[in-house]
């Protein structure tokens, strides 16, 4: 019996199309596939960022695969050909591995890259990123921000920089059409007359960095003798009510502090006959239905009511 062998894929490479971390892995069929014309050859692809513990494994019939990577680190990938058992009258046959690596040659020392990069998607409408210059860089250093997400045909540069002393320290983004629920890639690079500047790469999803506006129109009604209903309205903007979770801070007579999280725009509070005054503030965040994470809004303006006045209103009604 002659042992069945198959060659690894040819021309395996990692291609950078300039999308700031979204890379193409591509290859050609192995040599000498003539013996297996009736067979559907598959490929097992493994890839990871260098330094990562685990490989991502994909089995595909295609000759390419695309995914996002962290370009602050190198990338390694390997691939081999799989002949299913149907083709070999027995067990699956695997070729040896073909390997490929990719990294961007780092310029400058790590300290020159931007520090404390922070991006917030205000009210699911306006994206703003800010950073601090690298350690020990001179005032002649300037940073430039580029971004890309699936739907753009190329990476775009920021056109509205936030500047301090002529130095770019942030970016106000334009309206970003169809940009949520997908990876959003950013590169901040820099230039200086005196020394090379290290680039930095960031990836996140916009729905996970939303900071809503605070809730508005806080009201308070007495439902019964010892029950108070607190109500508020969702903030203006594109975020639907079902996407909010709220945190309420309630103060009774400047002593008791209750903090609770609720899903709806109402909260019923039990009070005692000793309660004289009631104050509350509310803040909002995008909930688990609409994001994996989020940023709490600022607190609403504080609203206070005298319980006696509420009771009078209730009795009148």
């Amino acid at each position: 019996d002659t042992e069945i062998k198959v060659n690894p894929p040819q021309d395996f490479e990692i291609v950078d199309p300039g999308y700031l971390g979204y890379l193409y892995l591509q290859w050609q069929p192995p040599l000498s596939l003539d013996n297996f014309k009736e067979c559907t050859v598959e490929y097992e692809l493994k890839y990871r960022n260098i330094g990562s513990e685990t490989w991502t494994t994909i089995i595909t019939k295609n000759l390419h695969y695309k995914d996002g990577f962290d370009l602050n680190k190198g990338i390694e990938a390997k691939i081999h050909t799989l002949l299913p058992w149907q083709c070999t009258n027995g067990s699956e046959v695997q070729s040896s591995w073909a390997e490929a690596t990719y990294w961007i040659s780092p310029q400058g020392i790590p300290e020159t890259k931007v520090q404390d990069m922070d991006c917030v998607y205000y009210n699911w409408q306006y994206l703003l990123c800010s950073w601090k210059p690298g350690i020990g860089v001179l005032l002649d250093t300037n940073y430039n921000l580029f971004y890309w997400y699936e739907g753009l045909d190329r990476a775009l540069q920021c056109v509205d920089y936030i500047k301090v002393d002529g130095q770019n320290i942030g970016c106000r983004f334009p309206y970003l059409e169809s940009s949520d629920y997908k990876d959003f890639y950013i590169c901040v690079n820099g230039s200086s007359e005196t020394k090379p500047i290290r680039s930095s790469y960031f990836t996140f999803q916009l729905q996970n960095i939303v900071k809503p506006l605070p809730p508005v129109c806080l009201t308070c009604t007495q439902e019964s003798l010892y029950e108070i209903k607190l109500k508020w309205s969702i903030p203006l903007g594109p975020i639907p009510a079902r996407c909010f979770v709220y945190e309420i801070e309630i103060r009774e007579d400047d002593t008791t502090l209750v903090t609770t999280t609720v899903e709806n725009e109402t909260y019923t509070l039990k009070i005692t006959n000793e309660t004289r005054q009631l104050c509350f503030v509310v803040r909002s965040k995008v909930n688990i239905y609409c994001s994996d994470d989020g940023i709490w809004s600022e607190w609403s303006d504080k609203q206070c009511w005298e319980v006696e006045e509420l009771l009078k209103k209730t009795l009148l009604l």
Partner: nanobody
Framework: QVQLQESGGGLVQPGGSLRLSCAAS????????MGWYRQAPGKQRERVAG???????VYAASVEGRFTISRDNAKNTGYLQMNNLKPEDTAVYYC?????????WGQGTQVTVSS
């Protein structure tokens, strides 16, 4: 039209376990979160657990440590594993799949905890 179908409810003794499933007829799981709610007779509907599209979870204090929510996006199905059930867990359990564009509810499945 997307539909959600709960299953796995039934009668169980205190201390027992049940696993509820919520199957969606369309592929709406990818970017949407899902939650399990319950409503006992004469009480308001309350959320017992929720899971984001990326797998972050939240639980009501009354079920923390006993219930586990999970999801299988490939199968368009969500699950609620309920252990150490108590009589006060008796209710109709509903699943909800929602997001910025969508909001779908199932018809509910009855869970009764009684000896």
């Amino acid at each position: 039209q997307v539909q959600l179908q709960e299953s796995g409810g039934g009668l169980v003794q205190p201390g027992g376990s049940l696993r509820l499933s919520c199957a969606a007829s369309g592929s709406i799981f990818n970017t949407n979160g899902m939650g399990w709610y319950r409503q006992a007779p004469g009480k308001q509907r309350e959320r017992v657990a929720g899971i984001s599209s990326g797998g972050n979870t939240v639980y009501a204090a009354s079920v923390e440590g006993r219930f586990t929510i999970s999801r299988d996006n490939a199968k368009n199905t969500g699950y609620l594993q309920m252990n150490n059930l108590k009589p006060e867990d008796t209710a109709v359990y509903y699943c909800r799949v929602a997001g910025r564009q969508d909001d779908y509810w199932g018809q509910g499945t009855q869970v009764t905890v009684s000896s």
